[in-house]
Interface confidence: medium
């Protein structure tokens, strides 16, 4: 068992021109936080692979706020070492998988945006217990440096922490009853003693008594972080009186840069120039492919035609961004209007609206009467931005959508008796009452109130019959009316419907663009 | 009549969580959705989200994501408000109010409920 | 989000005059603002709905105007019960958004 410690130094725009002035974006104020994932062995690893030794991740850093027109300047960093603890044997070789990531602190439509900045991806050979390994990768435009190392965590020790070791206060033999005890070492290989006071943050030893400084910090304790304008500088000169370890004389001697790379001396250190598609202090690193599963969430890996972009990812639906890191929220767009409630179904999304909205996005106002409000034959009336069915005989409620008793109003006048009928009810009145509704009264000296009737009309007159007939026309008149009236509007449902499956078909793509 | 009963206060330790209620009554609870409406000391109305209480549907301002989590009890005609990791920023007057059925958002309002969070 | 920019914040009347308060979207909000009365003791109170819509049992001495981003609130002939705080809102899209309030008191 032990621990993979890794240590970010700095993290910054590369050199050269085009290089980014701010992690942020234009939205505002963000702060950077690392991921490290360990796979085991140097073979190219499944896209998709776990990071089957460990990973970790580190705190946020704090926040950076762009200054305009100051140059950009190293990025405030998290604090501490980022540890990914193994439990069984160091396999000597992995594959160290860095990601920057930018956690974007605007105005953003569901909280914080998160977002990779740069994944770096070293495969190395590393003993455990052996020193700080210092490193300078560089991913597109960005450029990172960090030390990193393996630990035994005693009574594990050794170059894979699989040989273990008694303490030396411990006993020879194990008790009585218990199984015999795993082969030990006759001694714990005790670490050496740093020089009192030297930080365990920041500082190392390999012999007793010494107090050697990760990269970017000095002074005898190691406490003291070194200035942005020596060694951390993103393009100044290493200088190793700050407690930098740079390499030695002719550092241009044997050229130290793979895959073609040229090599420039700068004051005390040398710099590469990579070819398209590698880069890191030595351009030994070629640029993110498919082989490192750049890809979250299921993303489709395609290798990019663009030589300076290695890959493309393709998202599901539901995720966006260059790696399909960002889980759209798609409801989070509010694409539903007047308040209708929004359902993420995955491969659809769909508004539940509020009464008095319909559509896809309930854009549609049915209180302006201009959708289907009113079932049933009802009429819509409108009035102050509300509306109002006049419901056909029979029906009643908001919508015209509940069946009413034609006879529960009390309709027939003047204690005349209601009966129900299929297109509405029918009133027969007491004597000395007649029309539609009994409203009319019959007068003493026979003639009736009725306006508008031919003069002498009785109700005992053989033309009563006509009147009869008349009205039974009219009701004929109606219900055909009705009828009518309720095929128009299937009919303009029909068309609304597929105008509203149009809509929203157009509404998922534009919400998957 | 329609009625909406919240309780009148609530005192929390920072860092905890406080589960409010509003019990309706009066109307049909099913049928009309429910609001949360947040207002902070001397400030304005914010607000926080509605619920369906047919299926427990509900619409989030993005500002309480991951702070408000709105539930109902069908059984008991309430819906509840859970605040979380609980700060003094979260020390308001929280609201129910009930969604009319037309196009009017919010027509009847619950006394409010007054969250103070101090350790 | 839309921003709804209640004004004034203040103002000070007598029984009797007439009053307006305005809100203003920051985008087109069509019909959809309502007003609402707070007043201490009581439940805030739905006046307006849909820009212009009375509240069914609000007095008709409160009326809505205004669509798209300008609207206001007018109260005429003032009764003793009206001096009490309003906030107008949007109900057109979510969040819904209120606006910062106006205190209205007696002269």
């Known amino acids: 068992a032990g621990v993979f410690e890794l240590q970010i130094h700095s993290f910054g725009p590369g050199p050269g021109p085009g290089a980014p002035r701010s992690p942020c974006s234009a939205r505002g104020p963000c702060r950077l936080f690392f991921r490290v994932c360990l796979k085991p062995g140097l073979s190219e690893e499944a896209a998709e692979s776990p990071c089957a030794l460990g990973a970790a991740l580190s705190a946020r850093g704090p926040v950076y706020t762009e200054q305009p027109e100051a140059p950009a300047p190293d990025l405030p960093l998290p604090n501490g070492l980022l540890q990914v603890p193994f439990r069984d044997a160091w396999p000597g070789t992995f594959s160290l998988i860095i990601e920057t990531w930018r956690e974007e602190l605007g105005d953003q439509i569901g909280g914080p945006a998160w977002s990779l900045l740069a994944r770096v991806t070293r495969r190395r050979r590393l003993a455990a217990g052996g020193p700080w390994a210092r490193d300078i990768q560089r991913a597109g435009a960005w450029e990172l440096r960090f030390s990193y190392r393996a630990r035994c965590e005693l009574p594990a020790v050794g170059t894979a922490c699989t040989r273990l070791c008694r303490p030396r206060s411990a006993p020879s033999r194990c008790g009585p009853g218990l199984r015999p005890c795993a082969p030990l070492e006759d001694e714990c290989e005790a670490p050496p003693v740093c020089r009192a006071g030297c930080s365990l943050e920041h500082g190392f030893c390999e012999q007793p008594g010494e107090c050697r400084c990760l990269e970017g910090w000095t002074g005898p304790l190691c406490m003291v972080p070194v200035s942005t304008s020596s060694c951390l500088g993103l393009r100044g000169p290493s200088s190793t009186t700050t407690g930098c370890l740079v390499p030695g004389p002719g550092p241009c001697d044997g050229n130290p840069c793979a895959n073609g790379g040229s090599c420039s001396e700068t004051p005390g250190s040398f710099e590469c120039t990579c070819p398209r598609g590698f880069y890191g202090l030595r351009c030994e690193v070629s640029g993110v492919t498919c082989a490192d599963g750049p890809c979250f969430n299921g993303g489709l890996c395609v290798g990019g035609a663009d030589p300076d972009s290695a890959y493309i990812c393709h998202c599901p639906p539901g995720f966006q961004g260059s790696n399909c890191e960002k889980r759209v929220d798609r409801c989070s767009l509010q694409p539903c209007r007047n308040g209708g409630l929004c359902l993420d179904l995955g491969h659809a999304l769909r508004c539940r609206c509020r009464a008095g909205f319909a559509g896809p996005r309930c854009e549609h106002d049915l209180d302006d009467c201009a959708g289907r409000a009113c079932a049933n034959g009802g009429t819509c009336v409108e009035g102050g931005g509300a509306h109002r069915c006049s419901c056909a005989l029979g029906f009643g409620g908001r919508n015209c959508r509940e069946r009413a008793d034609p006879c529960a109003a009390r309709p027939c006048a003047h204690g005349g008796r209601c009966y129900a009928h299929f297109s509405g009810l029918v009133c027969a009145c007491a004597p000395g009452y007649m029309g539609a509704r009994c409203e009319f009264p019959v007068h003493p000296d026979g003639v009736s109130a009725l306006p508008a009737a031919p003069p002498g009309l009785r109700p005992g007159d053989p033309q009563r019959a006509g009147v009869i007939a008349v009205i039974v026309v009219v009701v004929i008149a109606i219900v055909a009316g009705i009828v009518v009236l309720v095929i128009s509007r299937k009919k303009r449902m029909a068309k609304y419907e597929k105008a509203e499956i149009k809509e929203m078909g157009e509404m998922h793509r534009e919400l998957n663009a | 009549q329609v009625q909406l009963q919240q309780p009148g206060a609530e005192l929390v330790r920072p860092g905890t969580s406080v589960k409010l209620s509003c019990k309706a009554s009066g109307y049909t609870f099913t049928s009309y959705w429910m609001h949360w409406v947040k207002q902070r000391p001397g400030q304005g109305l914010e607000w926080i989200g509605v619920?369906?209480?047919?299926?427990?549907?509900?619409n989030y301002n993005q500002e309480f994501k991951g702070k408000a989590t709105l539930t109902v009890d069908t059984s008991s005609s309430t819906a509840y408000m859970q605040l979380s990791s609980l700060t003094s920023e979260d020390s308001a007057v929280y609201y129910c109010?009930?969604?009319?059925?037309?196009?009017?958002?919010?027509?009847?309002w619950g006394q409010g409920t007054s969250v103070t969070v101090s350790s | 989000d839309v921003q709804i920019t209640q004004s004034p914040s203040y103002l000070a009347a007598s029984p009797g005059e007439t009053i307006t308060i305005n809100c203003r979207a920051s985008t087109s909000i069509s019909k959809y603002l309502a007003w609402y009365q707070e007043r201490p003791g009581k439940t805030n109170k739905l006046l307006i709905y849909s820009g212009s819509t009375l509240q069914s049992g609000i007095p008709s001495r409160f009326r809505g105007s205004g669509s798209g981003t300008d609207f206001t609130l007018t109260i005429s002939s003032l009764e003793p019960e009206d001096f009490a705080m309003y906030y107008c809102?949007?109900?057109?899209?979510?969040?819904?958004?209120f606006g910062g309030g106006t205190k209205l008191e007696i002269k």
């Open positions: 619920i369906d209480p047919s299926d427990s549907l509900a």
């Open positions: 809102q949007q109900h057109h899209v979510y969040p819904y958004t």
């Open positions: 109010a009930r969604d009319s059925t037309v196009v009017a958002p919010m027509d009847y």
